[in-house]
């Protein structure tokens, strides 16, 4: 089938990094500068993504693969493929319209991005607070007082934190 296809369509023989040039009797020409083709048999090469300004180049464009951008230091990516950059805050803060603000009492953020989240309510699981929460860390829940008999397990790790949503700019 491959031999039949290549007899019918000479373009199928053009490897990644080239394109099938209709202007030159369908011979395989290399992708021009700042363009790429990641698969064979392409009739055009795609333009490379440009990483400028708040973006920096994480991976250079080659003839067979696109450039990849990430954000300059002090910023983090939003969106698939890093389509936007948002300012980092410190742990214990969240980004608001007025900039980075400390988490309110009873909430925490252990990352440089995302929103402040409420401390775990240990009593909902019938547990007691073993280690108090801070702006940067969730509380650590321990066994309920009734469970504190000799030989009882002492610390239950907190439930995993949910993924923070994107915070406002």
């Amino acid at each position: 089938f491959e031999r039949t296809r290549s007899l019918q369509d000479p373009c199928s023989n053009c490897p990644a990094g080239t394109f099938c040039d209709n202007n030159r009797n369908q011979i395989c020409s290399p992708c021009p500068p700042n363009s790429f083709s990641s698969a064979g048999g392409q009739r055009t090469c795609d333009i490379c993504r440009q990483c400028k300004g708040v973006f920096r180049t994480r991976k250079e464009c080659s003839s067979t693969s696109n450039a990849e951008c990430d954000c300059t230091p002090g910023f983090h990516c939003l969106g698939a493929g890093c389509s936007m950059c948002e300012q980092d805050c410190k742990q214990g803060q969240e980004l608001t319209k007025k900039g980075c603000k400390d988490c309110c009492f009873g909430t925490f953020n252990d990352q440089k991005r995302g929103i402040c989240r409420p401390w775990t309510n240990c009593s909902l699981d019938g547990k007691s607070v073993l280690v108090n929460g801070t702006k940067e860390r969730d509380v650590v829940c321990g066994p309920s007082p009734a469970d504190l008999s000799p030989g009882a397990s002492s610390v239950t790790p907190p439930a995993p934190a949910r993924e923070p949503g994107h915070s406002p700019q």
Partner: antibody, heavy 115, light 107 residues
């Protein structure tokens, strides 16, 4: 709070130089760059160019021979200069903070080119 | 330069209607397309970035989809306050370029 505000003369004579400033607050000029975008009356948006946080610039080839974008960090201002203007340069001019997708814009300033 | 061809240029719909706007790029731009809303006398406002991500505070009735060269912006249930002109723009390659706009009116 992030704010950008364009200012400059609302009327410029043909062949003269259009000069606008974008005064910003709520963010550092050493951290963010700014784009200039214009919109002729009743028409769409056109990217003019940008200045990045390091001070380097990129311009639309359609303007490259007559545009200059610069920054004055001491005044928290970016500036746009467009020389040899014609009536076709009549537009609302916007500055927008560089974050990859233009989340923050100035309110825009109308510049009319007329004798 | 990458051309962004937006259609329709204008449309009229009733409150509650589903409204769809399309944008076609002249080259593959991945998912690096944003959608903006502009009301008369105001600056454009970012609604969608990265083709499908709603920006902070944007109502859930606004959505975007697409990749490569074909993109769609949808208002699931048109509200009176949605009367505006909507623009797509590509943030993939310089010079950055925008569609011609779609003016949305209420019937």
């Amino acid at each position: 709070q992030v704010q950008l505000q364009e200012s400059g003369p609302g009327l410029v004579k043909p062949s003269e130089t259009l000069s606008l400033t974008c005064t910003v607050s709520g963010f550092s000029l050493t951290t963010y760059g700014v784009h200039w975008i214009r919109q002729p009356p009743g028409k769409g948006l056109e990217w003019i160019g940008a200045i990045w946080s390091g001070g380097s610039t990129d311009y639309n080839a359609a303007f490259i021979s007559r545009v200059t974008i610069s920054v004055d960090t001491s005044k928290n201002q970016f500036s746009l200069k467009l020389s040899s203007v014609t009536a076709a340069d009549t537009a609302v001019y916007y500055c927008a903070r560089d974050d990859g997708s233009f989340a923050n814009w100035g309110q825009g300033t109308l510049v009319t080119v007329s004798s | 330069d990458i051309q962004m061809t937006q259609s329709p240029s204008s449309l009229s719909a009733s409150v509650g209607d589903r409204v769809t706007i399309t944008c076609k790029a002249s080259e593959n731009v991945g998912t690096y397309v944003s959608w903006y809303q502009q009301k008369p006398g105001k600056a454009p406002k970012l609604l969608i970035y990265g083709a499908s991500n709603r920006y902070t505070g944007v109502p859930s009735r606004f959505s975007g989809s697409g990749s490569g060269t074909d993109f769609t912006f949808t208002i699931s249930s048109l509200q009176p306050e949605d009367i505006a002109t909507y623009y797509c723009g590509q943030t993939y390659s310089y010079p950055l370029t925008f569609g011609g706009g779609t003016k949305v009116e209420i019937k």
